[in-house]
């Protein structure tokens, strides 16, 4: 799903207040709900009818440093016999997410939000049409 | 997928530098890759063998203000005949994502990162075993 454009209004102070100096604002250290857990370590990527693999990208100047991308293993979907059914399609499910980019010059460190497109997994769909003649 | 704990080291200055004052840091206005777009197949939520609906949550003090959550429509998966196959299960694909929380008292505005668990869509899986006793 798509993150709407910021329009930068979200990060502005109310009109009656003095403007933010130098085009930056205060970001508190710490993360709300940091201990929240995903209950998904169940190998669904292998047991799905539209299975996928994971690739990890690593960037020490990004938070989170590790971003995991899914790639569908097949074009078709896997049927009950474990064979690829090419009348159905494995398609990626994508999600826009935010990361934080760290920029530093010596002891001057600043941060900026960055939008990243993540493929989270795959799902099996019926194609809209089979052939265009 | 799970976002690792910050350990707060990411947001710290190098050891040789003076510490961040007041437990906050500088966040630049603007978002990198703001114009990037999701290129997901059309209506996959309805054409999937594990279809889902979307619910939108709205919070003006969160960026993005709109967070979309998927809910699987069925327990089983939809077969080629359009019937629910109860030997297969529709399961959610979940992703931890970051949002920005805005906190203000009068003209003093600060921001904090928050982890949110988003269900992005659903996929069809074969359960490992039939019964646990």
């Amino acid at each position: 799903r798509k993150i709407p454009k910021v329009g930068h209004t979200f990060f502005q102070k109310p009109e009656s207040c003095p403007p933010v100096p130098g085009g930056s604002m205060k970001l508190d250290i710490g993360i709300i709900n940091e201990n929240q857990r995903v209950s998904m370590s169940r190998n669904i990527e292998s047991r799905s009818t539209s299975p996928w693999n994971y690739t990890v990208t690593w960037d020490p100047n990004r938070y989170p440093s590790e971003v995991v991308q899914a790639q569908c293993r097949n074009l078709g979907c896997i049927n009950a016999q474990g064979k690829e059914d090419i009348s159905m399609n494995s398609v990626p499910i994508q999600q826009e997410t935010l990361v934080v980019r760290r920029k530093h010059q010596g002891c001057s460190v600043s941060f900026q939000l960055e939008k990243v497109l993540v493929t989270v997994g795959c799902t099996c769909v019926t194609p809209v049409i089979h052939h265009v003649q | 997928r799970k976002i690792p704990k910050v350990g707060h080291t990411f947001f710290q200055k190098p050891e040789s530098c003076p510490p961040v004052p007041g437990g906050s840091m500088k966040l630049d206005i603007g978002i990198i890759n703001e114009n990037q777009r999701v290129s997901m197949s059309r209506n996959i939520e309805s054409r999937s063998t594990s279809p889902w609906n979307y619910t939108v949550t709205w919070d003006p003090n969160r960026y993005p203000s709109e967070v979309v959550q998927a809910q699987c429509r069925n327990l089983g998966c939809i077969n080629a005949q359009g019937k629910e196959d109860i030997s297969m299960n529709s399961v959610p694909i979940q992703q931890e994502t970051l949002v920005v929380r805005r906190k203000h008292q009068g003209c003093s505005v600060s921001f904090q990162l928050e982890k949110v668990l988003v269900t992005v869509g659903c996929t069809c899986v074969t359960p490992v075993i039939h019964h646990v006793q």
Partner: antibody, heavy 123, light 106 residues
Framework: EVQLQQSGPELVKPGASVKISCKTS????????MHWVKQSHGKRLEWIGG????????SYNQNFKGKATLTVDKSSSTASMELRSLTSEDSAVFYC????????????????WGQGTSVTVSS | DIQMTQSPSSLSASVGDRVTITCSAS?????MHWYQQKPGKVPKLLIY???KLASGVPSRFSGSGSGTDFTLTISSLQPEDVATYYC?????????FGQGTKLEIK
Amino acid sequence: EVQLQQSGPELVKPGASVKISCKTSGYTFNEYTMHWVKQSHGKRLEWIGGINPNSGGVSYNQNFKGKATLTVDKSSSTASMELRSLTSEDSAVFYCARGGDGYYTNYFDIDYWGQGTSVTVSS
Amino acid sequence: DIQMTQSPSSLSASVGDRVTITCSASSSVNYMHWYQQKPGKVPKLLIYDTSKLASGVPSRFSGSGSGTDFTLTISSLQPEDVATYYCQQWNSHPLTFGQGTKLEIK
């Protein structure tokens, strides 16, 4: 220990609605499906439907669509079923029964049962 | 819907007898479960996936069959086996149960 504690017996008038609940303990409520089963007096068991709190998925027996509505309250680990437009045919004992998690065990595998709630429809 | 027909609807047998209950499905199913419901109690899973014994169930109970015809057998009937037995198909939506077989001791 897994426990499913159902609400008490109900005596309701024809045309009315009733909501029966199933409070759970001893397991992570969100991760398992909850099914509802009807047993008319001394008769066969009929599966009404099931709901999974984690996925949001619901599955109904077509014979009960429009008659039964299944809901969950994650905060209290409680599943509920509302029955509407009741007639004497709806007089029965209704069971909640835990199904699988969808990952390791199939959603439709029933292992634990509540003690049953008797619903009597009478004017 | 797949219809499940049990036979007999009721039966009376003596302690130590071998008892057989059959369940016929209106179309082919992959798996059959059997439940035992003692008077005034909730149903309890007895046999799952046609032939697997549920936890805590005595070995005198067994299940077999395939396709449309399935059988529950009690090799040596005990007084505590007085109950109604239900078959349940787990193949096609919706889940369906047999009408039940009421077992009594002579």
